[in-house]
């Protein structure tokens, strides 16, 4: 996935006494927060695996790539990165694995250049609808975000609020239509059971969508029609049983698409006929010869591409008078 990377060598590490001595003053141009490593040449600050409980206040103004991974941040409040002068250069922010369970409205405000954000591997029980849009206006100022990485952000079952996790995430993605420019969205490993039907229509710039390793059973109510720029759609490791005609036609109509469907429990009965016909003709499915039946038992491991209509039967439904109890 796309996390901020660094070409940095020559990191400088500040002494803790220096940071505390100047913490009340505006940051010096070349200052490095305590427990962080900084490279001005690479415009990179790394505060990694330091058990930080809050975002350092004295981040250098030059920072372009900020790694705050492996910490214990718990809550990201409004304006968590608001500074005077603002962090105008910050383009890539990685907060993965930092024990975040709450991201509040406006957490990423005042970051005019923020293009990549990675919140993966945080148990986000409370993601504000306005976490990315910053305001509750029906139409917000466009967010500069181009890549949003939200893999494995589902909290443990007992920590979830009494609401749909899918709904909470989607509300944050759609609020104020702020993410119209988003090109990459990764939502892997989140136990999603369904995809709310309106989400994709409002993210028209998407090039890459990763929904792998969820629990999606069906795409019947999901429309891909508006995603004319979509280049990759990852649906591996879900619970998909079959793709129906409407979905197949929409996928086929996307000019640049590559679809990944491996490791789904395909049900090879009469309802699979259209999908098999489509698979034989389409070029959009990557590794299509690796798709195999999971059910019924007599079809297990059969390669979908090698099936014909005679193989795909449905047991007849007996009239009630003929059914055994």
């Amino acid at each position: 996935s796309s996390s901020p990377t660094s070409s940095a060598s020559s990191f400088s590490s500040s002494a803790p006494f220096l940071a505390s001595a100047v913490s009340a003053q505006p940051p010096l141009p070349d200052q490095c927060p305590a427990l962080c490593e900084c490279s001005e040449a690479a415009r990179t600050v790394k505060c990694v695996n330091r058990n930080l409980t809050e975002v350092p206040t004295d981040l250098p103004a030059y920072v372009r790539n900020l790694f705050l991974t492996g910490n214990q941040l718990a809550v990201l409040p409004a304006g968590a990165f608001a500074r005077r002068p603002p962090l105008a250069e910050l383009a890539a922010l990685n907060l993965s694995g930092s024990r975040l369970d709450e991201v509040r409205a406006g957490a990423f405000e005042h970051l005019p250049s923020l293009r990549q954000l990675d919140l993966s591997h945080n148990p986000l029980a409370d993601l504000s609808p306005f976490a990315f849009s910053g305001s509750n206006a029906s139409v917000s100022a466009p967010s500069p975000l181009v890549e949003l990485i939200l893999n494995h952000i589902v909290p443990p079952e007992d920590e979830r609020q009494n609401r749909s996790f899918e709904g909470m995430v989607v509300a944050a993605l759609l609020a104020g239509r702020a993410l119209q420019g988003l090109r990459r969205l990764e939502l892997a490993s989140n136990h999603f059971l369904y995809l709310p039907r309106d989400v994709l229509a409002q993210l028209p710039s998407l090039r890459h969508l990763d929904l792998s390793n969820n629990s999606l059973v069906s795409l019947t109510y999901v429309s891909f029609r508006n995603l004319t720029h979509l280049e990759s759609l990852h649906l591996e490791d879900n619970a998909l049983k079959v793709l129906h005609n409407g979905t197949l036609a929409e996928l086929q109509g996307l000019p640049h698409i590559r679809v990944f469907l491996d490791n789904n429990p395909w049900v090879c009965d009469c309802h699979m006929a259209d999908m098999v016909t489509w698979l034989k003709e389409t070029e959009v499915v990557q590794g299509k010869d690796r798709l195999t039946c999971a059910y019924p038992e007599k079809m297990r491991n059969r390669v979908l591409l090698e099936l014909n209509s005679a193989d795909l039967d449905c047991d007849p439904i007996l009239p009630p008078s003929l059914q055994t109890s």
Epitope: D237, N263, T292, R300, N301, R302, V303, L305, E306, L307
Partner: antibody, heavy 116, light 107 residues
Framework: QVQLQQSGAELMKPGASMRLSCKAT????????LEWIKRRPGHGLEWIGE????????NYNEKFKGKATFTAETSSNTAYMQLTSLTTEDSAIYYC?????????WGQGTTLTVSS | DIQMTQSTSSLSASLGDRVTISCSAS??????LNWYQQKPDGTVKLLIY???SLHSGVPSRFSGSGSGTDYSLTISNLEPEDIAIYYC?????????FGGGTKVEMK
């Protein structure tokens, strides 16, 4: 019922090449992946790779690329594995198995001994 | 490649014992795990597929469980014919990989 019958034991010289065969009966040969697995004492089982006979598609374990080559003859329902530039490390029992997500039927294995 | 580790290479048990064999993956494999039995004569059979599904013809004393990276095979009531080497195998990602095997012997 499904059966996979493998060719008999072989004694080969280092540097030689050889071809093992696996004849499938009792199922649609072209409809399933056919796997090849190596077993050596102290090394357990190693997946070499697989072939989809109807299409000739193959997947190889990187470790065996250049060592093993898979082919299949659909007219006789037989899969083959060619092993080249044999060394003593290639001495093992080689299995074919009907594959996919699990290997539900296995051949009896072919013992290959490489010795000068 | 995903590494599969069977921490116990051999174990001894008595007839009728409950035997549990463990297997761990170097990363999450999403229940994409199978168990095989290799008899002393070299024959290999599938016992359990997709973590917990019993392959047809396999006695019900065999069962599988697990999730994420940790999986196990249980023989609830050991019989003489269960003397064998047991292998786990992941099919989450190519290349498919096997554990090193656990040899079950009679006390």
């Amino acid at each position: 019922q499904v059966q996979l019958q493998q060719s008999g034991a072989e004694l080969m010289k280092p540097g030689a090449s050889m071809r093992l065969s696996c004849k499938a009966t009792g199922y649609t040969f072209t409809g399933y992946w056919l796997e090849w697995i190596k077993r050596r004492p102290g090394h357990g089982l190693e997946w070499i790779g697989e072939i989809l006979p109807g299409r000739g598609s193959t997947n190889y374990n990187e470790k065996f690329k250049g060592k093993a080559t898979f082919t299949a003859e659909t007219s006789s329902n037989t899969a083959y594995m060619q092993l080249t530039s044999l060394t003593t490390e290639d001495s093992a029992i080689y299995y074919c198995a009907r594959g996919g997500r699990d290997f539900d039927n296995w051949g009896q294995g072919t013992t290959l001994t490489v010795s000068s | 490649d995903i590494q599969m580790t069977q921490s116990t290479s051999s174990l001894s048990a008595s007839l009728g014992d409950r035997v549990t064999i463990s297997c761990s993956a170097s990363q999450g494999i999403n229940n994409h795990l199978n168990w095989y039995q290799q008899k002393p004569d070299g024959t290999v059979k599938l016992l359990i597929y997709y973590t917990s599904s019993l392959h047809s013809g396999v006695p019900s004393r065999f069962s599988g469980s697990g999730s994420g990276t940790d999986y196990s095979l249980t023989i609830s009531n050991l019989e003489p014919e269960d003397i064998a080497i047991y292998y786990c195998q992941q099919f989450s990602k190519l290349p498919y990989t096997f554990g090193g095997g656990t040899k079950v012997e009679m006390k």
